[in-house]
């Protein structure tokens, strides 16, 4: 069979080889398509409801005024010329529709390096057969499930027209130190050959590189955290990050009910102030980061170092924040 591709909605003429150019003709067309149950026979006499779908022209050709999806199938013509020689024509008709230019919707203007990001959703509407969507990054095709690339695809078919809408959502994990302004594009490749790919306008999101927070330093004064009763301890939380994060304080693993501050002053130390202290820095773009813990203890007169163990008591005493 000869393969014929026809665009949906456009006319199609199939020649009946060997048929006399004008009546009287001995020919018949047989169709097996989505409109027929088994084979439908059409003759030059025509007439009836089929004339609006397909009719035999005076020269024996079959004319379809507007091809539809249901017209995909096999078309055969059997004709006898004036000398009684029989000729057969056999066509396999496939139909297509080129969609509108694909578009990227919900596109991100900024991506974060090192974590998965949604780049955008590529949408192609009105294709037949469905075809495929593919993504490119800086001239290279992106392969799903490789190097932090994932693609969620969805194909919907219009209940009335039978045309396809394709959606492809791209997620990527940009490498740290990679291209700061990558170019993504999406293209539609048709399901039938001979019809060129269609491509979206490219998008160029910026890649934001999160600066790894340097370690949170906790400085204690006096050094070592051992102080005589009634003395003062100053705890300072040093965070190099900019802008300055919020600093909260913990004692024995429990947050202290105090407003954020980088300095914690413990004046007039009493037994209830003994324990393990740490600070927690919370940056707007990072999770919380905790410092090392330091132990604050009371030295009784005559002792040279911190007392063994810590004295109980949950009172905060007279706590001051700088």
């Amino acid at each position: 069979a000869q393969n014929i591709t026809a665009r949906i909605g456009e006319p199609l003429v199939l020649k009946c080889k060997g048929a006399p150019k004008k009546p009287p003709q001995r020919l018949e067309w047989k169709l097996n398509t989505g409109r027929t149950e088994a084979w439908k026979v059409l003759s030059p006499q025509g007439g009836g409801p089929w004339d609006s779908v397909a009719r035999v022209l005076p020269n024996g050709s079959l004319f379809l005024p507007a091809v539809g999806i249901q017209d995909e199938g096999i078309f055969r013509c059997q004709a006898m010329n004036r000398n009684g020689k029989e000729t057969k024509s056999n066509y396999r008709v496939r139909v297509y529709q080129i969609p509108g230019k694909p578009e990227i919707v919900d596109s991100a203007s900024e991506l974060t390096a090192g974590v998965p990001n949604k780049v955008g959703t590529c949408v192609s509407e009105g294709s037949y057969p469905a075809g495929t969507l593919s993504w490119h990054l800086d001239g290279k095709p992106l392969v799903p499930n490789e190097k932090g690339v994932s693609v969620k695809e969805q194909t919907r078919r219009h209940p009335e027209t039978g045309l396809f809408t394709l959606q492809s959502e791209l997620m990527v994990t940009p490498a740290r130190g990679g291209d700061p302004r990558p170019t993504f594009s999406c293209s539609f490749s048709p399901g039938l050959p001979r019809h060129r790919a269609l491509r979206t306008a490219p998008i160029q999101p910026r890649v934001w590189e999160p600066v790894p927070l340097e370690e949170v330093q906790l400085v204690v004064e006096p050094e070592g955290g051992a102080v005589a009763p009634g003395g003062t301890v100053t705890l300072t939380c040093e965070v190099p990050a900019q802008p300055s994060p919020q600093i909260h304080w913990m004692k024995d693993g429990v947050p202290l009910p105090l407003p954020p501050s980088p300095v914690l002053i413990l004046p007039e130390i009493g037994p209830q102030d003994q324990g393990t202290y740490s600070c927690v820095a919370t940056h707007s773009s990072h999770g919380p980061q905790e410092s090392r813990a330091v132990s604050i203890s009371i030295i009784e007169p005559g002792e040279e170092g911190p007392t063994a163990g810590s004295v109980g008591g949950s009172g905060l005493g007279t706590l001051a924040l700088a």
Epitope: S134, G139, R181, H195, Q204
Partner: antibody
């Protein structure tokens, strides 16, 4: 109309460097990528790499990574290619060609001939 | 990298005749194939993109076909001005690669 105007022929000594230009006109320079292609006398076409003038992203084939440097000046709509540590193997015609993103090369410059000779 | 192979480096042709130039990719390129014509002393000129789409101003005697890895450029009724070297190029993935070229020579 759309044009890519390349600089004139270069004669250079082995070990030297040359910098050639490709001036774009008739379209928005940052909307298209600029590619460079090498053709040695009597030989075929060899893609060197491209620059995206909008983002200044560049890509080279490995053999040209240390040989070619692609740059672009948006203000003058000009792309440049510098070739360093020249040898006789670098004697060739170098073409610039534009593409709409990662697409075919629809407009080409006339080429710059580089001759490396002592 | 995707390799492009043009099986004939030279083709001996007759004016008015039909010419077929073939190009094979080492991997599927999804119809992302271009054909260029180059005449001596000139820059290449784009003839066909998307494997089959003729560029504006290119005579209709040129046509492109193929799919998957195999592609063809055809010239019917060859004219004197068609005597040139023809290159295929894939732009499915960087590094973009050209075929070795096919030079047409008059018989």
């Amino acid at each position: 109309q759309v044009q890519l105007q390349q600089s004139g022929a270069e004669l250079a000594k082995p070990g030297a460097s040359v910098k050639m230009s490709c001036r774009a006109s008739g379209y928005t320079f940052t909307d298209y990528w600029m590619h460079w292609v090498k053709q040695r006398p009597g030989q075929g076409l060899e893609w060197i790499g491209f620059i995206n003038p909008s983002t200044v992203y560049t890509e080279y084939i490995p053999k040209f990574k240390d040989k070619a440097t692609l740059t672009a000046d948006k203000s003058s709509s000009t792309a440049y290619m510098q070739l360093s540590s020249l040898t006789s193997e670098d004697s060739a015609v170098y073409y610039c060609a534009r593409s709409d993103g990662g697409w075919y090369f629809d407009v080409w410059g006339a080429g710059t001939t580089v001759t490396v000779s002592s | 990298d995707i390799q492009m192979t043009q099986s004939s480096s030279y083709l001996s042709v007759s004016l008015g005749g039909r010419v077929t130039i073939t190009c094979k990719a080492s991997d599927r390129i999804n119809y992302w194939l271009a054909w260029y014509q180059q005449k001596p002393g000139n820059a290449p000129r784009l003839l066909i993109s998307g494997a089959t789409t003729l560029e504006t101003g290119v005579p209709s005697r040129f046509s492109g076909s193929g799919s998957g890895k195999d592609y063809t450029l055809s010239i019917t009724s060859l004219q004197t001005e068609d005597v040139a070297t023809y290159y295929c190029q894939q732009y499915w993935s960087t590094p973009y690669t050209f075929g070795g070229g096919t030079k047409l020579e008059l018989k």
